[in-house]
Amino acid sequence: ATKLTEEKYELKEGQTLDVKCDYTLEKFASSQKAWQIIRDGEMPKTLACTERPSKNSHPVQVGRIILEDYHDHGLLRVRMVNLQVEDSGLYQCVIYQPPKEPHMLFDRIRLVVTKGFSGTPGSNENSTQNVYKIPPTTTKALCPLYTSPRTVTQAPPKSTADVSTPDSEINLTNVTDIIRVPVFN
């Protein structure tokens, strides 16, 4: 079995998680991709997904989650803005490839969000500009509801330094509403 590795991200409330998930562009450029949370002993839960087929560089926003799929680069960018303590947990990027199982990209992400705003936009940002242009249009999410039972695994044991995932759901706005953020030319 493939060893599932975790990458730990420690951020403060209000900061932005910014993850780059690489993929083989020749194989997966237009495939639908998703951001999932994994709770111990449960099936991964899809929080946001790209369109099907995935549109090049068009941001999709679901609540505080923004997905940007860069076909030209083989890169899915995932941002979770205005992080809250209850966002702490284990996440993963996946590619949907029905009828096969979803293909996991990158390491799983162990996100630990602590109290106390740091005063910076994000732990890995030094942006001179950081403006998100979000138009008022919304549309229904088309994320597949299935997850292969074989992907249900007991999550790797947490280190003692990790913060446990809370029982409460992630505090997102209506996950069925996707805001399409156009690229401004």
Epitope: E7, K8, K20, D22, Y23, N56, S57, Y70, D72, H73, G74, L75, F106, D107, S123, N124, E125, N126, S127, T128, Q129, N130, V131, Y132, K133, V183, F184, N185
Partner: antibody, heavy 116, light 107 residues
Framework: EVQLVESGGGLVQPGGSLRLSCAAS????????MSWVRQAPGKGLDWVAS????????YYVESVKGRFTISRDNAKNSLHLQMNSLRAEDTAVYYC?????????WGQGTLVTVSS | EIVMTQSPATLSVSPGERATLSCRAS??????LAWYQQKSGQAPRLLIY???IRATGIPARFSGSGSGTEFTLTISSLQSEDFAVYYC?????????FGGGTKVEIK
């Protein structure tokens, strides 16, 4: 075929200014992050700045913040780097590159020499 | 800032032999690592991204491995056109940073 052609380099005195330009073709410019990377003579590579498709996110290396400004014109498929208050240590070949994090395509570079 | 350190600075290899280049990050960059090749007088070229994914058009003799802080670029059988300088680069965090390079020269 992706083509990135830089222009605007040259010799400038310390404290002076230069504006570099990059003409892009062969790909959808408006869908791509773009960046500038530089290389001092005989040295390694140094990232300078990156700009998102709609310029809503811009990042700079600390040493050029407040002196350099990256910009783009999607209608003209062009990328720019306005360089002010130039220093001797800014002397380098400046490459226009496609990508905001890693760099898939590179121009041939334009040499900027800062010297009195 | 994440500091990238490459070793060795120079690697002398005979054509047909295997070359192994190392790159170390001062903190974890997960798999957000790229490798570039730069021949004398030319612009760099992307070889590997995501630590192990070959870029479009790159021959199979180039392979990347590693995750976290330790990475390796392997050229399985060096061809004459492979003698060049190789750079690693992390893109997990801003600022984006490159290693100092490894020059692969003919032994």
């Amino acid at each position: 075929e992706v083509q990135l052609v830089e222009s605007g380099g040259g010799l400038v005195q310390p404290g002076g200014s230069l504006r570099l330009s990059c003409a892009a073709s062969g790909f959808t410019f408006s869908s791509n992050w773009m960046s500038w990377v530089r290389q001092a003579p005989g040295k390694g590579l140094d990232w300078v700045a990156s700009i998102k498709q709609d310029a809503s996110e811009i990042y700079y290396v600390e040493s050029v913040k407040g002196r350099f400004t990256i910009s783009r014109d999607n209608a003209k498929n062009s990328l720019h780097l306005q360089m002010n208050s130039l220093r001797a240590e800014d002397t380098a070949v400046y490459y226009c590159v496609r990508g905001g994090w890693r760099f898939e395509s590179w121009g041939q570079g334009t040499l900027v020499t800062v010297s009195s | 800032e994440i500091v990238m350190t490459q070793s060795p600075a120079t690697l002398s290899v005979s054509p047909g032999e295997r070359a192994t280049l190392s790159c170390r990050a001062s903190q974890s960059v997960s798999s957000n690592l790229a490798w570039y090749q730069q021949k004398s007088g030319q612009a760099p070229r992307l070889l590997i991204y995501g630590a192990s994914i070959r870029a479009t058009g790159i021959p199979a003799r180039f392979s990347g491995s590693g995750s976290g802080t330790e990475f390796t670029l392997t050229i399985s059988s060096l061809q004459s056109e492979d003698f060049a300088v190789y750079y690693c680069q992390q893109y997990k965090n801003w600022p984006l940073t490159f290693g100092g390079g490894t020059k692969v020269e003919i032994k």
